[in-house]
């Protein structure tokens, strides 16, 4: 029997290196069967995930997946960090893996850590 659970397809340990000043769309791929669930984005702050209430979002449909998109127009230096999308479905809360944005501020040319650095500093990924 085909699964009709809601699925959020953000890849585990996914990351995106982006430039401050550029536009960027962060995708939360959502699979559902009947009624589209209520989906939100939050930004991780320590162990809590702070809901992003007043940010521009939109839906995009393709094939059997919908994409709940968080818009950065433009990306700001303080957009650096880890994000998660969540879906409310039949009174259940389903949370995605976190996805990390590494924002390079063109002015300061600060670079995101290398994968080797991240391996030795796992709190960058698991916050």
């Amino acid at each position: 029997k085909e699964s009709c659970d809601v699925q959020l397809y953000i890849k585990r340990q996914s990351e995106h290196s982006i430039l401050a000043g550029d536009p960027f769309e962060l995708e939360c791929p959502v699979k559902y069967c009947a009624n589209r669930p209520h989906v939100t984005w939050c930004k991780l702050n320590g162990t809590t995930c702070v809901k992003l209430e007043d940010r521009q979002t939109s839906w995009k449909e393709e094939k059997n997946i919908s994409f709940f998109i968080l818009h950065f127009e433009p990306v700001l230096p303080n957009d650096n960090g880890s994000y998660r999308c969540s879906a409310n479905f039949q009174s259940n809360l389903i949370e995605s893996h976190s996805t990390t944005l590494y924002v390079t501020d063109v002015k300061s040319a600060s670079e995101r850590p290398s994968k080797d650095e991240m391996a030795s500093r796992p709190w960058l990924l698991y916050r």
């Epitope: 397809y9 585990r12 996914s14 290196s17 960027f24 997946i65």
Partner: antibody, heavy 116, light 106 residues
Framework: QVQLQESGPGLVKPSETLSLTCTVS????????WSWIRQPPGKGLEWIGY???????NYNPSLKSRVTISADTSKNQFSLKLSSVTAADTAVYYC??????????WGQGTTVTVSS | AIQLTQSPSSLSASVGDRVTITCRAS??????LAWYQQKPGKAPKLLIY???SLESGVPSRFSGSGSGTDFTLTISSLQPEDFATYYC????????FGGGTKVEIK
Amino acid sequence: QVQLQESGPGLVKPSETLSLTCTVSGGSISSYYWSWIRQPPGKGLEWIGYISYSGSTNYNPSLKSRVTISADTSKNQFSLKLSSVTAADTAVYYCARDFYYGMDVWGQGTTVTVSS
Amino acid sequence: AIQLTQSPSSLSASVGDRVTITCRASQGISSALAWYQQKPGKAPKLLIYDASSLESGVPSRFSGSGSGTDFTLTISSLQPEDFATYYCHQFDYYPTFGGGTKVEIK
């Protein structure tokens, strides 16, 4: 309808760099993830790596030191470079769209032989 | 990386037979598993995703089940065009494929 087409030399000398390009039509590489997979003659499938819609990459740990995947959004192409090749890298190389839950669109594959 | 072990590596069957292929993951992957069909000289074709969801355009005789570490692909009534090699695939951080199961004509 999204279609993928691999291109590149079919013969590469040992110790040289294998370079392949995947051209995407009917869709944009600015969404989704885009993978390279290979299949040695008579063997199974091996994932090489992917590039995301933002340009971030993830590689098979066993190949990581030799692999680079990049994208050219203006041409709607993504590319594979595999350095220091040996006969063990002889395979059919496929590009595919990683539609989050699996690879739903594949190129037809291109055969690369490593031989002097 | 997570390893996938498929069994059997090959099987012989007749048209109309019910065929079952299993895939075992070296650690739990929830339902993050897909199944592909590959015919000689062709690219793989996605059949099943999320362990049990049928990809668009795939005949309903194909079905998938399982969660965690043990998964099954079933062909309810084998058709002539189903003779091929089948692969399972987990799409965790480092994706991997099973070794394949070749379905041959008895």
